[in-house]
Interface confidence: medium
Amino acid sequence: MDGSGEQPRGGGPTSSEQIMKTGALLLQGFIQDRAGRMGGEAPELALDPVPQDASTKKLSECLKRIGDELDSNMELQRMIAAVDTDSPREVFFRVAADMFSDGNFNWGRVVALFYFASKLVLKALCTKVPELIRTIMGWTLDFLRERLLGWIQDQGGWDGLLSYFGTPTWQTVTIFVAGVLTASLTIWKKMG
């Protein structure tokens, strides 16, 4: 990732501000959607609803679809279930760092990061640690800003996600996403 130097200004799709705003909206919506599928109300996730434009709605639908597919990957679910959340910050940043450790960036890995964050949030809900929820969202946005922002800008903003997953082979790509996350969790388990 080309990391240094000033970022584009203004409100275009590749500005730092717009990428972070859209990223926060997508992450919040994705986590709320995953929690909703668990059944039951989660007042801790009653974050301020933010109006989404047509483009963001499309992106949200795309993420939901990938999330559903990942939910059905039993190997991935088994790995996530085995994650020890006693030190969630260390787990999150190690797994996130390992996902991108080879220096190669793609939308699949960005989605894998969001999915892992959502799973940690759901674990926090299940273990009655609601204060962790906003914190995990914060960690994800920190990582996004520090590691992925430049790359997302290079892709023309978040809309690049739609073209990446908008192909007939998006299920194949989703299998790849699951593989990336499973591999990172495996590395973390070995190191932990």
């Epitope: 240094s4 260390e90 920190d142």
Partner: antibody, heavy 117, light 109 residues
């Protein structure tokens, strides 16, 4: 042009408090991450604390945890380091820096904090 | 915490010499390593980020490389203005956000 300007340093007695400011210009602090790094006389660089205003996340070195507090006022585009229970070993030049990706790309000129009786 | 062991702590060299400074991470830090130059009484300046990327405005005689957990800063032909102290720094993940090496002072022979 990106600029970071620190202020608030000075002489303080052990156990005393001091608040350092880091005024940023040329970029939006809200979407950035700001870090305080210190350098004791004749010594190397030591990371002290970080803040990510967008998410509200803050991180501290073990040596200052519980004594120092990093914060940001995005309306003033300024970050702060509140230093309490100061010790002689906190004597150093304190720099604020902005990071992007894997590096701190812009640094302030530094402000000297001397803890002595 | 991740430790960054920098060597040598100081070295003497002449103008035109090729200078190499190394940093070893105590565990994998991917390519999340930067190098800085600091002159007396001044703030550090970024030279290299992401292990091998040259920061804008930095002369091309500076280069960085990575081999596993070993990171190297090379100055291909030392210039008078290069006499300074150099630091490596890692930022792999934020359990301890940034760790600096001990520094290498490059002096005139």
């Amino acid at each position: 042009e990106v600029q970071l300007v620190e202020s608030g340093g000075g002489l303080v007695q052990p156990g005393g408090s001091l608040r350092l400011s880091c005024a940023a210009s040329g970029f939006n602090l809200y979407y950035s991450s700001i870090h305080w790094v210190r350098q004791a006389p004749g010594k190397g660089l030591e990371w002290v604390a970080s803040i990510y205003p967008y998410s509200g996340s803050t991180y501290y070195a073990d040596s200052v945890k519980g004594r120092f507090t990093i914060s940001a006022d995005t309306s003033k585009n300024t970050a702060y380091l509140q230093m309490n229970s100061l010790r002689a070993e906190d004597t150093a030049v304190y720099y604020c820096a902005r990071s992007y990706g894997y590096a701190m790309d812009y640094w302030g000129q530094g402000t000297l904090v001397t803890v002595s009786s | 915490d991740i430790q960054m062991t920098q060597s040598p702590s100081s070295l003497s060299a002449s103008v035109g010499d090729r200078v190499t400074i190394t940093c070893r991470a105590s565990q994998s830090v991917s390519s999340a390593v930067a190098w800085y130059q600091q002159k007396p009484g001044k703030a550090p300046k970024l030279l290299i980020y992401s292990a091998s990327s040259l920061y804008s405005g930095v002369p091309s005689r500076f280069s960085g490389s990575r081999s596993g957990t070993d990171f190297t800063l090379t100055i291909s032909s030392l210039q008078p203005e290069d006499f300074a102290t150099y630091y490596c720094q890692q930022s792999y993940y934020w359990v301890s956000p940034f760790t600096f090496g001990q520094g290498t002072k490059v002096e005139i022979k």
